[in-house]
Interface confidence: low
Amino acid sequence: QDVRVQVLPEVRGQLGGTVELPCHLLPPVPGLYISLVTWQRPDAPANHQNVAAFHPKMGPSFPSPKPGSERLSFVSAKQSTGQDTEAELQDATLALHGLTVEDEGNYTCEFATFPKGSVRGMTWLRVIAKPKNQAEAQKVTFSQDPTTVALCISKEGRPPARISWLSSLDWEAKETQVSGTLAGTVTVTSRFTLVPSGRADGVTVTCKVEHESFEEPALIPVTLSVRYPPEVSISGYDDNWYLGRTDATLSCDVRSNPEPTGYDWSTTSGTFPTSAVAQGSQLVIHAVDSLFNTTFVCTVTNAVGMGRAEQVIFVRETPNTAGAGATGG
């Protein structure tokens, strides 16, 4: 009956942690004698290829300084302790402690048997490092040029983390990778870039970080902050301003970041009716007269700049009773 070595094609271990490389000789064959088990690194320099051995009588030895005896152990293999006890070498699983980047590579588990000869299996050990993630908004001011408005950083991952963004905005991502402070790790930075406008201010985007060490993608929400000049509109005109009307008000409606610092009401004609009183964002009209046949302008300033809106007013001789709403506020 043929025997075979059962290993995993690939084993992953965390940088700095402990990993087990399973190795089993199957099936159990009566009368089969295992004369030696060795673990080798076939890709290492010749004098470092044999990293561990287990002899049925003498037990384990760790001939190579890398990884070295202080970081290696056989998990289950047992040596014979006398005439009455047989060595148990069918399970040659090897544990590596304090994993380093240098430990990554191919490992061959080989059983020397009688009468079947030598059989081996190979495992690829991957050393991974779980990255630490953070995402943050960048305070930016509106412009016509694409600007980084959010950063997502995945620090010291191995292999590098994959960063993507979830957003309905019109954006693009720019990624950079640099070596982490831990040898063999990579810090990935993704810059969420768009042309910053008021439409993006306060919008939440999500940085999605994927890494094989995560059981699920990390989803990190980021609320964008864009400073932009006031976006202004005027409300309150209901197309039913008539001579003598006393309940009219215009409101200057503003979206801005930061908050407005000043409101200025004017007219395009340069003449400002005396019965119109500016009260911050509101223009209160005590009595409509013919001077209101003009275009009112609300100019709003904030720390970024200025915005303005115009409202054309048509003054009627008499109230318009044909379906005019009472929305003059």
């Epitope: 993507s164 963004w165 957003s167 999605k208 699920e216 989803l219 990190i220 929400p221």
Partner: antibody
Framework: QEQLEESGGRLVTPGTPLTLTCTAS????????MSWVRQAPGKGLEWIGL?????SAYYASWAKGRFTISRTSTTVDLRITSPTTEDTATYFC???FGDGFNLWGPGTLVTISS | SFVLTQPASVQVDLGQTVSLTCTAD??????ASWYQQKPGQAPVLLIY???SRPSGVPDRFSGSSSGNTATLTISGAQAGDEADYYC?????????????FGGGTQLTVTG
């Protein structure tokens, strides 16, 4: 033992908003992304949406505007904003972990009928 | 939109091996997961990340993936395996994020 349980399923008339609630035992809901999945009678599974640990909600394209997912520290809620008869189904909440849904509640039946 | 296609029904003889397929209409970057649902019960996760099996799931269930097709293999089918099986994957576009289920396969164990 880790468990999920949905509640709030009942018979309502079309257009009457309905909120379903998912509660957990044996683990902290706030540590997980949570999904809602539904299954119409005799039909397959249909993913509605997910709320992540940062409280951002994501929806299937067909579910946007029809459902709202929210959470507290101990519950995850699904609001059906204006149910129609096509929303009659068993609604499951599912813990979303790794690349799959690794823990499901038994489901709660919602019937929309006039 | 992203579609996963599964055969509506599959039959297998008791003790035999059966493979259930799940084909995406476009190549996906995401992993597949598989669920078993018995009548009147909630689904149960069988396979995640194409090939990984949660603890407690018998090793008769295995997953694989090639190209845009994921496969759930059940070896030594038992009467208790009769159920509906669903695949799912994450459809993660640049501006969207959603999961998609296949239509499900009804597995019948005969004999």
């Amino acid at each position: 033992q880790e468990q999920l349980e949905e509640s709030g399923g009942r018979l309502v008339t079309p257009g009457t908003p309905l909120t379903l609630t998912c509660t957990a035992s044996g683990f902290s809901l706030s540590s997980y992304h949570m999904s809602w999945v539904r299954q119409a009678p005799g039909k397959g599974l249909e993913w509605i949406g997910l709320i992540n640990t940062g409280d951002s909600a994501y929806y299937a394209s067909w579910a946007k505007g029809r459902f709202t997912i929210s959470r507290t520290s101990t519950t995850v809620d699904l609001r059906i904003t204006s149910p129609t008869t096509e929303d009659t189904a068993t609604y499951f909440c599912a813990r979303t972990f790794g690349d799959g849904f690794n823990l499901w509640g038994p489901g709660t039946l919602v019937t929309i009928s006039s | 939109s992203f579609v996963l296609t599964q055969p509506a029904s599959v039959q297998v003889d008791l003790g035999q091996t059966v493979s259930l397929t799940c084909t995406a209409d476009t190549l996906s970057r995401s992993y597949a997961s598989w669920y078993q649902q018995k009548p009147g019960q909630a689904p149960v996760l069988l396979i995640y990340r194409d090939t990984s099996r949660p603890s407690g799931v018998p090793d008769r269930f295995s997953g694989s993936s090639s190209g845009n097709t994921a496969t759930l293999t059940i070896s030594g089918a038992q009467a208790g395996d009769e159920a509906d099986y669903y695949c799912a994957t994450e459809d993660s576009g640049d501006s969207s994020y959603q999961y998609v289920f296949g239509g499900g396969t009804q597995l019948t164990v005969t004999g």
